[in-house]
């Protein structure tokens, strides 16, 4: 028997220092967690430890801090060349910068194979691309070679920016014709990596016929045998196991995401490849495990630049930008109606010509707006300024609900009015009116939504039985300030861009901003 | 002994076919991969086909694809190619070999060739 | 597909040289080539495999370097029997490739 260890992580996004608990900007140092110098020290304990290792990364390095906005992915590839990492496969984030924004900062210049089977380059880009990311990769472990197989939400087009050059493949349909050449080049250990989420990590398992491990990502799933060590709920056993169509058990892990756990996978393969046992659990890492001096040395040079561009201009506003608690947990607020254009306008993807846009529409609970921006200095915007309007460094994420559910949502929005709660909802491509004189749960008179199919958008009544699509923070898709019926009732979430980096985007794209309350919510009485 | 045997080569006319035969004794023929290469004559070898220990993925060289069919039968210990539609620029001596135990494929038994001539 | 660039395509060398042939490959391959000796009439035999480990019951004369696009055999002192063409072989992807060869010679 041939015993293998998988370290893994995936949805880093950005997490290059380490973090509070919840992932957000460390303050007590002594309770953080995470951080590439952390989890440095942590994976060459066990390379020391153990003879054959490998450290895989199951994609979405890419965005979720300011070390994403201003490196743009040069960090990325410095970090994970400095940690060795063995394999990373394509995120759909990893396309957040168009694809000269993957080549030139992280295919170009990592030391490791980065993979995705079913993406294939078209047009002029297939010879630009082509050898910078590959299908799979055969890697040498001690005396054996284990296969790697790649794979990337074929969502891509519609969660991030990867052009008309790409065309995103069915999964199971790409992979199955790379694991049978890998079979027959004699490489009887195969590992799936790849970023699609847990439910296709399950049926690649099921359905892939020589995979013998599949190393997830994309939906941050939490697998745990035993009591859990922080606060993540698991979603399952470590490792959740699938029974094959050709009745193999096939293990499936995640590390939850942002760096706070370091996956850690037993494997014992018998001579011709086959899983006879595997067992693990993330490692949690927190501050018992020291951050070596050398990549910590190495994060504080790079956090330099940082600290400069946190203050620079990013753009100007010539109207009082009013974020305030009074406006935006009562009423429609100009702030409110900036974040919302922003997160659809970094939501615009021409993928269909029937549809102007797949999206039109965003919320975003009144409560998440922590700070105004005063226009009287000089109009100046800086980071900085942002970064106290979205403290939380959340995302603004794309779901689909069904239209009873988007009621519920909005019911909820006013079920309490007037105490200044968190719930009550700023909105885009929204006209909605409420009567506060009838009951709760009743208060939604009139609630119209702008049309994605249609080439001169105009707002029609919500269908209750139709699927939309949404644009939210990720507060609110995980059932934050009560909106357990969206967590619940969601068709589907894909997890989106850092929230600052969204606004800063607009911000700068749009260089001087006015945003007006123009009606998008309204108060009546009586009868409609 | 470990062993491969080829049979079946010969001399063929443009357009016909032949098949070739390749036995195998010495080892467990079903663990693994087998190939054809063939050389011309004066000439470097050239991979044509492999086909997978249980005899599912095939793979083919450009120059042979859609004519040659590799085949094998486990219970006789025996690897075949199948050839259609020759030409004279097949004219080769073709030997079957193993692709060895563990990757990356090495052909690390061969057979002694059989010769096939194609000519008017 | 992956083309295998051998040189020199023949050498002229006396027994108890040093004799190396390299084998250049169009793409990365990492270190997934194979090094096989041919003697006239005769069937390719296995000298090296994975860039450098050799194989079982091959002289320890041949050894084989490099990973990537840049491969060597040398044959540390020639011994009248290692006159033969020597082939390199890729099996990093399908179609497998061979490289041209390369015959040593008696000087």
């Known amino acids: 028997a041939w015993e293998l260890t998988i370290l893994h992580t995936n949805d880093v996004h950005s997490r290059l220092e380490q973090t509070s608990e919840d992932s957000s900007k460390c303050v007590n140092a002594s309770r953080c967690m995470g951080g590439v110098a952390r989890l440095f020290t942590k994976v060459q304990q066990i390379r020391r430890a153990e003879p054959n290792v490998l450290l895989l990364d199951a994609g979405d390095q890419y965005q979720g801090t300011i070390w994403f906005t201003v490196y743009k992915g040069a960090e990325v590839a410095h970090f994970m060349n400095a940690l060795r990492y063995d394999a990373m496969a394509l995120g759909n984030h990893e396309f957040d910068n168009g694809v000269e924004g993957l080549i030139e900062p992280l295919l170009k210049e990592a030391k490791f194979p980065i993979l995705s089977a079913n993406i294939k380059a078209k047009g002029p880009l297939a010879s630009q691309i082509s050898g910078l990311y590959l299908p799979y990769k055969v890697l040498p472990v001690g005396d054996e070679v284990v296969g790697i197989v790649g794979y990337t939400s074929k969502e891509t087009p519609f969660l991030s920016n990867p052009g008309t050059n790409l065309v995103f493949e069915d999964e199971i349909t790409a992979l199955q014709p790379e694991v049978d050449k890998l079979k027959t080049l004699n490489v009887n250990k195969i590992i799936a990596l790849g970023h699609s989420g847990f439910e296709m990590d399950k049926l690649i398992a099921q359905k892939v016929r020589g995979v013998d491990v599949v190393v997830g990502g994309h939906s941050n799933t939490f697998l745990y045998t035993g009591n859990p060590p922080s606060k993540e709920v698991p979603a399952g056993k470590y490792p959740f196991i699938v029974t094959s169509d050709d009745g193999r058990k096939v293990p499936v892990v995640q590390a939850y995401a942002f760096g706070k756990y370091l996956g850690y996978l037993k494997i014992e393969f018998d001579e011709r490849g086959n899983v006879i046992s595997s067992h693990g659990n993330p490692i949690l890492l927190n501050s018992s495990i020291p951050e070596d001096p050398s990549i910590k040395a190495d994060i504080n040079k790079w956090r330099i630049k940082l600290d400069n561009y946190s203050t620079q201009e990013l753009g100007k506003t010539i109207v009082y930008l009013d974020g305030s608690s009074q406006s935006c947990r009562f009423r429609e607020c100009n702030m409110g109606n900036l974040i919302c254009d922003a997160m659809i306008n970094n939501n615009l993807r021409h993928t269909d010509e029937m549809f102007w846009n797949h999206v039109s529409m965003c919320i975003l609970n009144g409560g998440g707006i922590r700070s105004p921006i005063d226009e009287r200095n000089n109009g100046t915007i800086t980071w900085e300024n942002l970064a106290a309007v979205l403290p939380f460094g959340g995302t603004f994420d794309l779901v689909q609900l069904k239209g009873s559910t988007l009621k519920k949502a909005f019911e909820h929005s006013v079920h309490r009015y007037g105490q200044s709660t968190g719930e009550f909802l700023q909105v885009g491509g929204i006209h909605v009116v409420y009567d506060l004189s009838r009951k709760p749960g009743d208060r939604v008179v009139k609630l119209d939504v702008l049309c994605t199919k249609c080439r001169v958008p105009s707002y029609d009544p919500l269908k209750m039985d139709e699927v939309y699509k949404v644009i939210l923070p990720n507060f609110l898709a995980n059932g934050g300030d009560g909106f357990q019926m969206i967590k619940d009732e969601l068709l589907r979430h894909d997890s989106g861009d850092q929230d600052i980096n969204v606004v800063s985007t607009y911000i700068s794209k749009m260089k001087v901003i006015y945003p007006a309350v123009e009606g998008r919510i309204k108060f009546s009485t009586g009868s409609h | 002994e470990v062993q491969l045997l080829e049979s079946g080569g010969g001399v063929v006319q443009p357009g016909r076919s032949l098949r070739l035969s390749c036995a195998a004794s010495?080892?467990?023929?079903?663990?693994?991969?087998m190939h054809w290469v063939r050389q011309a004559p004066g000439k470097g070898l050239e991979w044509v086909a492999v086909?997978?220990?249980?005899?599912?993925?095939?793979y083919y060289a450009d120059s042979v694809k859609g004519r040659f069919t590799i085949s094998r039968d486990n219970s006789k210990n025996t690897l075949y190619l199948q050839m259609n539609s020759l030409r004279a620029e097949d004219t080769a001596v073709y030997y079957c070999?193993?692709?060895?135990?563990?990757?990356?494929?090495?052909?690390?038994?061969w057979g002694q060739g059989t010769m096939v001539t194609v000519s008017s | 597909d992956i083309q295998l660039t051998q040189s020199p395509s023949s050498v002229s060398a006396s027994v108890g040289d040093r004799v190396t042939i390299t084998c250049r490959a169009s793409?990365?391959?990492?270190?997934?080539l194979a090094w096989y000796q041919q003697k006239p009439g005769k069937a390719p035999k296995l000298l090296i495999y994975?860039?450098?480990s050799l194989q079982s019951g091959v002289p320890s004369r041949f050894s084989g370097s490099g990973s990537g696009t840049d491969f060597t055999l040398t044959i540390s002192s020639l011994q009248p029997e290692d006159f033969a063409t020597y082939y390199c072989?890729?099996?990093?992807?399908?179609?497998?490739?061979f490289g041209g060869g390369t015959k040593v010679e008696i000087k």
């Open positions: 070999a193993r692709g060895g135990a563990r990757y990356p494929i090495a052909f690390d038994i």
């Open positions: 010495g080892f467990t023929f079903n663990f693994y991969g």
């Open positions: 086909i997978n220990d249980e005899g599912i993925n095939k």
């Open positions: 793409q990365d391959i990492s270190s997934w």
């Open positions: 994975a860039a450098s």
């Open positions: 072989q890729q099996a990093n992807d399908f179609p497998i490739t």
